[in-house]
Structure formats: structure tokens, C-alpha cells
């Protein structure tokens, strides 16, 4: 009977634990004529056998560390041995058992750390390997600090990333480590397999010696620079220093200014490159960055503050060529006529911008001089001596000196004497009746003309009319513009009308003068008018609560996860149906009723974030009007891309024979997101057999050096496998191959006889 252990020839996969003696057959393949026998090929390693009748079995225990997957092929043959079915792939996956202990790559590690280094920033990696499967607990390593010597006040200054072996400072270590007090520390580190969670885990230990060095990468004190300096530029204003020589310094202008007047040299000295103008910009904040030779930041940037000190380089300025005020002829002594407000661009609340006001001339001097006074510091003009008479002098001109501590400016004021305001505005109609408008009437439309008259002196503040809506328009949908020549009021639409919230509005207007009424006169009913605004319904499209909806999720969320939601309302109260538009990647679906948005496929930050789609809200029924809004899905990175080589390294070569051990540098990258400090890869040889010939050493977080251990290489191509671990969560590892050719050289290039020009290496080492 066909079942779990027998059946026709087809691709199959079997999983078998390593280390177990064979206890049963793997599978019995059944032959269909003309097939009479079976043949097994591929990675049999003389362990896997198929009998002529199709019985597939293995004859001794498997070892995952020798081969984790056996790729076999089974073919059915006829009586002549000709393949009549297949070959089909048969995959044997060897399941891991914990039969290997972790071992540190070194029995002793040495490293150094700067005082005040950022907590959590690795300065040293310990690295252990376990031949067991890293995808199972058997090969999942757990690093721990067993002891720190010396231990001061029972405080740990060092911490280790349990998964990656990255050693960094704790917050206390960052604050308290001081080479003057204690220049060296020793750590004993243990590594356990089984993720550290089992009593049956294997372990190993190593010793780490750490030197503490002084940190001089510190932000300098804020700098003050006087504006408009006449000294020769550039002028050194401050400095920064990286802890070691050879750093490459640069300044970063976060504000993206059109002109950035600072520079830094390769000593770390910071200069101002041209005179500053406080009135243009009174302070600068920028950053000093130190990078290594590969352009990677060595540490966090330092914030540089430059304050520009004011000098009195701006005179006072008048608010306008002539400032005009009005005064009624019966006004009392001491009444305010108006305030002259001059300006000074120098720094506020300093002597450089503190202004004094003084009347230097009055014309005409009738009936006498000194009719007006000005408050020295406030600039307020007052009536000083007596009431004025328009028929005697209808206009006065004052020259006023405005001064700061160094500069003087003359400003001109014209004072018009006007008739007393003893007449109120009177509407020609008290009721402007009813007006019916559709709710989609254009903004800016004039919907009504109103008119009041005032018998006071024409073209003065006493007769000028200002119209206000004092009732019936709390939303401010309407406004009134006044024609200054005719005092006609034009009622205009300032905001959209809305049938749903205000179908009928009872509007009340008030007409007022800008000048105060004389004592005893008051506005009465004649200065008020009304009208009724009736708004008719227009079917409107749904309205989204936001123009853009934003949500943020991790790129590895499970399919079916709610990732956001949108809301819209229909002004007429109809139900709304939601849909998506422009979901080019097919990642999302929207609940038509609730507006909730769900993932329907795996998301991928590396394909592009934010992912932008449009959401459409459509009326259900009615005229099916719709509106569109944006939904932006910001994808947060997870470590889902293994490291790889940053570029194509075909064509690396050494000239044969080697006169001395050689080395070459390569760079790794991955497609995940890296914060300011960039990736932190660790590098090791891909298999133990390579260690006799090669060694790999880390240069920084992205670069490593591959070196030969001797000079006795054959004249051929070697493929060096390198394991690159990204130390992420979870850590991902890539195995990459660097093809290195040893070849005869002519003038530093690989020599190939004519006719053998394919694949000439192009990079000599």
C-alpha cells in the first residue's frame, strides 16, 4: 500500500536526525513499466543506498556538521539501464543535535575603550563558534560576563550583548571610568550553547583585558563672535580633537543655510570665514564630525554653538514717511492722540535698540508752540496745553527725533484736527430681508450691499463707517468690506456655507466710527440692521478627517495585521464605502465599512518606505460622490537581510610566486537600516580548512582584511569563503566567496598566453 514510506517516483524531502544509527528504511519507490530498477546519484557520501527494487535507506549515522543537506537524485531505469523516469530530486535534511561545544576563537582578547564612550556602543567583540545549527538552540550562543576585575562598589562598568558578543560600556561605565583612577580591567566571559537556557548546554570561557584611555572628543564651550568684525578672515574661534591622529573632520550645517560661514581644517580647528551680521542671523548651531579613512563616523557629532554679539550698527527707522493722526477739536488735555512706534534692528532689550523720542519742531506754532508732548520712551503723543480749533488751524506737522545711543533719526507726524463725532451712523434700511443661497456658493462672492450714512465731517474718522456682524455668524463665514469713499458695505462669503450646520442664519450688522463718540452721544437702533440667510443643500462628497493618514509598523508584521485606519464623514449623513487606489505592491486591503487597513502580504522596508497609497471614500447611495486622501505606511526595519559583499570582487590576484605574505581589503554591506554609527559586521573564515592558508581581520564595522598566512600557493584560482555576521536581532550571517587568483605577472598584471584571455583578474595585490 502507498503511504508514508512507499509510493511513486517524485521529488521528496526527508528529515533525519544526525548521530542516530539507521533504524528503518527511508522510502520504497515503486517502479512503473518499462522501469525495472532504480539508480541513486548525488551527495550519497556512501551513506545513502537504493536497492534495485527501489528501497532507499542509509547505512550509518549522519553528521550535520559534515553535510547539512544531502542533495540526491533518484532515476528509474529500464532493462537496458536507460533513464525512463526522473531523475527527481530527493533532499535529505540532516537535523541537528547538540554534539558540538562552543569555542572562543581566542583564549585571550585585548581591547581598549575611551572614557565617556557612548553606553552600548561596542568597542570589542568576542567571538565563539559552534558547529551546530545556528537556527536551532544547539548552535545559538549566549555570552555572559562571569566576573569584572576590579569591581568597584559592586557596579558593572561593562556589558556584553548576549547574542553577538559585543562588549560595551554600561551607563555607569560611561560616566565613571577614569584612566587616572583605574587604567585597566579584566573580564572573564563565558559562552553557552542552547541559548544559555539548558542545564545540558556546553560552554567555554575566555579572558578579556581592557585598557581605558582618555577621551578628548568633547564639545567646546559656546563661542561668542562680535558681528561685522573687521579683522582678517578666516578667524579661529574654537577647536575639536579626535582621540587619535588621522581623523577626517567636517562640519554639518543642519539648517541648510544659503551661506554657511564656518570651516574646519584637518587639525580640528574651527574658523569663521567671513564677517557675521547679527541682524541676518543671531546664532548658529552646527556639528563637528570625525570620520575614519573610509568615511565612517568615529563617534557621535559634537554640537558647536556660536552666538553673534550685537554692535550698534543700525539707526532707528520711522514706521512710514509720514505718520497721520486725528484729534477731535473738543478733546481734553492729556488725551492720547496716537503712538509713534519707530524700529531699531539691533538686539532687542539692549542699549543698542533702546529708543528716545523728542519733539524738535511744531508747525504752525499757533496759537502757541508746545501744544503736543511725546512720552520719551513710549512714543505716545498727547494734547499738552489746550483744546484745538479746526477753523483756526486744521493741521499740525511735528518733527520728532528718535535716537538710540549712537544714532538719531527724524520722523514726521501729521495731526489733523477734525470735527467732533456727535452724529451716529444710520442704516438706510433696518431689515434687508431674506437671501437664499446654495451651500456651494463661491468664497469671495458678494451676496448683499448695505448702506449707512453719517452726518459728521466727511473723510474723517468721525464719519467713516466700519460694519461688523455682531450676531448670527459665530463661524465667521461672512465678512463686510467698506468702500471708503461711499461708506457702502459689501457682504462677502469668507468661508464655505454649510446647510448641514447652519441652514438659516439671522444676521445682525452694527455700523460704527473708528473715532469715539462725544460724551453723551451713544449708538442706538438706527446703527443696527438685520437680514436672514437661507442656505440650500447641495450633495457634497465625503470629507476625510485628515489630508494624510500615517501609520508605522515593523516590516515583519504577520499577514492580516491591522496597520492603520482612516475615517471620513459624509456631510449628508450617508454611509461610506472605503477602497484603496494605487496599492501597486498588493500589500494592503481596507475594510469597506470601518476603514481599517490590514496587511495581506509580507511587507519589505527595503522595497521602499513609506509605502504610499490613496484611500477613496465613496457615498453609498445618493450620487456616489467620492473623495481621496493619502495613507502613508512607514515601515520600521527588522534585521532581515544577511550581509553581502558591497561590490563585485572578481579579478583579485596576487603575482605568483609570492615574495611575502600579501593582503587585500574588502567591504561588506547589507540592505537593512543602520543608525548613525553604521553597520557592525564581524568577519571569520567560512570553513576551518581555510585557516592554514588565510586569515581575516576586522578593520572597522564594514571593512576587513584578507591576508595570506604563507607564500606557498599554487598558480591557480582559490575561492575563499568568508562568513559575515551582522550582529543584528536576530543576527544574520552571509557566506560570501572571494575568488583570488595566483598568476604569473608581467609589469604588475596577470599574464595570459594568447587565446586564454577569459577572466583576467584586474586587481593586483
Amino acid at each position: 500500500q502507498e503511504g508514508k514510506f512507499s509510493g511513486p517516483l517524485k521529488p521528496m524531502t526527508f528529515s533525519i536526525y544526525e548521530g542516530q544509527e539507521p533504524s528503518q528504511i527511508i522510502f520504497q519507490f515503486k517502479a512503473n513499466p518499462p522501469a525495472v530498477t532504480f539508480e541513486l546519484t548525488g551527495e550519497t557520501d556512501n551513506i545513502f543506498v537504493i536497492e534495485r527494487e527501489g528501497l532507499l535507506y542509509y547505512n550509518r549515522a549522519l553528521d550535520r556538521e559534515t553535510r547539512s543537506t544531502h542533495n540526491l537524485q533518484v532515476a528509474a531505469l529500464d532493462a537496458n539501464g536507460i533513464i525512463v523516469e526522473g531523475p527527481v530530486p530527493i533532499t535529505i535534511k540532516v537535523k541537528d543535535i547538540n554534539d558540538n561545544r562552543p569555542t572562543f576563537l581566542q583564549s585571550k582578547y585585548e581591547g581598549s575603550v575611551r572614557q565617556n564612550s557612548r553606553p552600548g556602543k561596542p568597542f570589542l567583540y568576542v567571538n565563539a563558534t559552534d558547529l551546530d545549527d545556528p537556527a536551532t538552540p544547539n548552535g545559538q550562543l549566549y555570552y555572559q560576563i562571569v566576573i569584572q576585575l576590579p569591581m568597584i562598589n559592586n557596579v558593572m562598568y561593562f556589558q556584553i550583548n548576549n547574542k553577538t558578543g559585543a562588549i560595551s560600556l554600561t551607563r555607569e561605565g560611561s560616566q565613571e571610568l577614569n584612566p587616572a583612577k583605574n587604567p585597566s580591567y579584566n573580564l572573564v566571559i563565558s559562552v553557552k550553547d542552547m541559548g544559555g537556557q539548558s542545564e545540558n548546554s556546553f560552554s567555554d570561557t575566555t579572558s578579556v583585558d581592557i585598557i581605558v584611555t582618555e577621551n578628548i572628543w568633547k564639545a567646546p564651550k559656546p563661542v561668542e563672535m562680535v558681528e561685522n568684525s573687521t579683522d582678517p578672515h578666516p578667524i579661529k574661534i574654537t577647536q575639536v580633537r579626535w582621540n587619535d591622529p588621522g581623523a577626517q573632520y567636517s562640519l554639518v550645517d543642519k539648517e541648510k543655510l544659503p551661506r554657511f560661514p564656518f570651516s574646519i581644517d584637518q587639525e580640528g580647528d574651527i574658523y569663521v570665514t567671513q564677517p557675521l551680521d547679527r541682524e541676518e542671523k543671531d546664532a548658529y548651531v552646527f556639528y563637528a564630525v570625525a570620520k575614519d579613512e573610509y568615511g565612517k563616523p568615529l563617534s557621535y557629532p559634537l554640537e558647536i554653538h556660536v552666538k553673534v554679539k550685537d554692535i550698534n550698527d543700525n539707526p532707528p527707522t520711522c514706521p512710514s514717511p509720514v505718520t497721520v493722526f486725528e484729534v477731535q477739536e473738543n478733546e481734553r488735555l492729556g488725551n492720547s492722540i496716537g503712538t509713534l512706534t519707530a524700529h531699531d534692528r539691533d538686539e532687542e532689550n539692549t542699549a543698542n535698540s533702546f529708543l528716545n523720542y523728542r519733539i524738535v519742531e511744531q508747525t504752525p506754532k499757533l496759537p502757541m508752540d508746545g501744544l503736543f508732548l511725546i512720552q520719551t520712551y513710549a512714543g505716545m503723543l498727547q494734547l499738552a496745553k489746550q483744546s484745538l480749533k479746526k477753523q483756526d488751524t486744521p493741521q499740525y506737522n511735528l518733527t520728532i527725533e528718535v535716537s538710540d545711543k549712537d544714532f538719531k533719526t527724524l520722523c514726521f507726524v501729521q495731526i489733523n484736527v477734525i470735527d467732533i463725532n456727535d452724529q451716529i451712523p444710520i442704516f438706510e434700511k433696518s431689515d434687508y430681508g431674506n437671501l437664499t443661497l446654495a451651500e456651494d456658493t463661491n468664497i469671495g462672492s458678494t451676496i448683499l450691499t448695505i448702506q449707512a450714512t453719517d452726518a459728521d465731517e466727511p473723510f474723517t474718522g468721525s464719519s467713516k463707517i466700519l460694519y461688523h456682524i455682531i450676531k448670527g455668524d459665530s463661524e465667521g463665514r461672512l465678512g463686510v468690506d467698506t468702500d471708503p469713499h461711499t461708506n457702502t458695505g459689501y457682504v462677502i462669503i469668507k468661508k464655505p456655507l454649510d446647510f448641514e450646520t447652519a441652514a438659516v442664519s439671522n444676521i445682525v450688522f452694527k455700523a460704527e466710527n473708528p473715532e469715539p463718540l462725544v460724551f453723551g452721544v451713544k449708538y442706538n437702533a438706527s446703527s443696527f440692521a438685520k437680514f436672514t440667510l437661507i442656505v440650500t443643500d447641495v450633495n457634497e462628497a465625503p470629507q476625510f478627517s485628515q489630508h494624510v493618514f500615517q501609520a508605522k509598523v515593523s516590516e515583519d508584521v504577520a499577514i492580516g495585521t491591522k496597520v492603520g485606519n482612516v475615517t471620513a464623514k459624509d456631510p449628508e449623513g450617508l454611509d461610506i464605502s472605503y477602497s484603496l487606489r494605487g496599492d501597486t505592491r498588493g500589500w494592503l486591503k481596507i475594510d469597506h465599512v470601518t476603514g481599517e487597513i490590514f496587511s495581506v502580504a509580507p511587507l519589505d522596508r527595503e522595497a521602499g518606505s513609506p509605502y504610499r497609497v490613496q484611500v477613496v471614500a465613496t457615498e453609498v447611495g445618493g450620487s456616489s460622490l467620492s473623495s481621496v486622501s493619502e495613507f502613508h505606511l512607514i515601515l520600521m526595519d527588522v534585521n532581515d537581510n544577511p550581509p553581502r559583499l558591497a561590490k563585485d570582487y572578481t579579478g583579485l590576484f596576487f603575482c605568483h610566486p609570492l615574495s611575502a605574505p600579501g593582503s587585500l581589503i574588502f567591504e561588506a554591506t547589507d540592505d537593512d537600516q543602520h543608525l548613525f554609527r553604521g553597520p557592525h559586521f564581524t568577519f571569520s573564515l567560512g570553513s576551518g580548512s581555510l585557516q592554514n592558508d588565510w586569515e581575516v581581520s576586522k578593520i572597522n564595522g564594514t571593512h576587513a582584511r584578507l591576508s595570506t598566512r604563507h607564500t606557498e600557493f599554487e598558480e591557480r584560482e582559490y575561492v575563499v569563503l568568508i562568513r559575515i555576521n551582522d550582529g543584528g536581532r536576530p543576527p544574520l550571517e552571509g557566506i560570501v566567496s572571494l575568488p583570488v587568483t595566483f598568476c604569473s605577472c608581467v609589469e604588475g598584471s596577470c599574464f595570459r598566453p594568447a587565446g586564454h584571455q577569459t577572466g583576467i583578474p584586474t586587481v593586483g595585490m
Epitope: 518499462p34 525495472v36 529500464d78 539501464g81
Partner: antibody, heavy 118, light 108 residues
């Protein structure tokens, strides 16, 4: 010793049929396939097909598919090849040959001359 | 079907000389599936070399075979009088099994 003995020469008219026999001895008849190969006068060798005596499964060269029949009688360890609707260009020496698994024709009969002539 | 082309059609050499016979295959085959047969006038073919390079029983060691993919060779290092015959190559990879047209080795 292993040998294959074929029937004697035949003279046939066009349109007739001929049946050639091949008796095996010195080995287990059902353990090897039996093939038929012909050779026209002054020409090369041409494979006609085979029979698996164990299962009676046969496979014929497309060229002869409609005219050839290969059979066997395991009780007397004999294989037969019958060619029908003979034409003058079927004049040839017909050989039986033992097929060695995943191998080659390791034993050949002495050949049977078939002459087709009106 | 797989076509085998032998060259030369006729090879005229004297005893003691070296002979090289070629067999070109229309598509690549495994070397274990290329065989050579010797036939003398009035006789049945005899297996001579199997699997490209293995000598059949009774074949003198002055014969050798080589090749891979689509190109195969039968070589006789020093011709003896009894070596003059027709040699056929044959493939055992897929149906129909096919032979080369033969190379006739004759005395010069």
C-alpha cells in the same frame, strides 16, 4: 559458453513476412535484454529495437514500428523478430545481440541473411 | 535521435603505423555510454571497447579509447595485420540506439 544461434537464410517476395529466431544458451535468458540489428549489403549497422524477456516489454525503432514484432518464448530461451510487408531494401543480414545492463551488445548471433526479391 | 559521425570513412595505413579513428556525437553524452565494435568481412560485429576506454575481453592493449562530451577517439598504437577491419562507434544514452556509419581501416 554464452552463445546466440540464429535461424538460417531466407528468400522472400516483396509484401511477404519473415520471422527470424535467436536461441540463447549459456546464461539466464530472462536476465538480459535481446536486441535486433540489421546490416544491408555494404552498409553500416542499424538498431531495430529490443525485447525484455523477463517482462515481455519491447521498444521498437520508429522506422520499423509498424512492421516489426519482437516476441520470446522463455521455455526454450528463444527470441523472435518478425518483419512484415517486406520491400527489396529490407534485404540485409539480421543479427540478434544480447544487451548488457547500462552497457553494450556483448554477445552477437552469427546473423541471418534475408533476401527480398520478386 | 543522436547522430554519430565517424571520420575518416576509410583509413589506409601500413602495419606498424599509428591509427586514430574519430567519432563525433550530435549532442553531449556520458563517456560511459559510448562503445566501439570491430567487424571483419563475413563476420558478426564484435564488442571491442566499451564505456569509451575499457577494452573488451581478448582485445590487445595496443588499442585504446578516449574522449568526452561529443568527441571520442579509438587509437591503435602500432597496427598489426589482424587489425584491418571496419570499426563502428555506438551510443547507449537514449532510444533509438544508433551507430556511426563505420571507418574502414585498410592496408596501404
Amino acid at each position: 559458453q554464452v552463445q546466440l544461434v540464429q535461424s538460417g537464410a531466407e528468400v522472400k517476395k516483396p509484401g511477404a513476412s519473415v520471422k527470424v529466431s535467436c536461441k540463447a544458451s549459456g546464461y539466464t535468458f530472462t536476465s538480459y535484454t535481446m536486441h535486433w540489428v540489421r546490416q544491408a549489403p555494404g552498409q553500416g549497422l542499424e538498431w531495430m529495437g529490443y525485447i525484455d524477456p523477463k517482462s515481455d516489454y519491447n521498444y521498437y525503432n520508429q522506422k520499423f514500428k509498424d512492421r516489426v514484432t519482437m516476441t520470446r518464448d522463455t521455455s526454450i530461451s528463444t527470441a523472435y523478430m518478425e518483419l512484415s510487408r517486406l520491400r527489396s531494401d529490407d534485404t540485409a543480414v539480421y543479427y540478434c545481440a544480447r544487451g548488457f545492463f547500462k552497457g553494450y551488445f556483448d554477445v552477437w548471433g552469427q546473423g541471418t541473411t534475408v533476401t527480398v526479391s520478386s | 535521435e543522436i547522430v554519430l559521425t565517424q571520420s575518416p570513412g576509410t583509413l589506409s595505413l601500413s602495419p606498424g603505423e599509428r591509427a586514430t579513428l574519430s567519432c563525433s556525437v550530435s549532442s553531449s553524452i556520458s563517456s560511459s555510454n559510448l562503445h566501439w565494435y570491430q567487424q571483419k568481412p563475413g563476420q558478426s560485429p564484435r564488442p571491442w571497447i566499451y564505456g569509451t576506454s575499457n577494452l573488451a575481453s581478448g582485445v590487445p592493449d595496443r588499442f585504446s579509447g578516449s574522449g568526452s562530451g561529443t568527441s571520442y577517439t579509438l587509437t591503435i598504437s602500432r597496427l598489426e595485420p589482424e587489425d584491418f577491419a571496419v570499426y563502428y562507434c555506438q551510443q547507449w544514452t537514449s532510444y533509438p540506439f544508433t551507430f556511426g556509419q563505420g571507418t574502414k581501416l585498410e592496408i596501404k
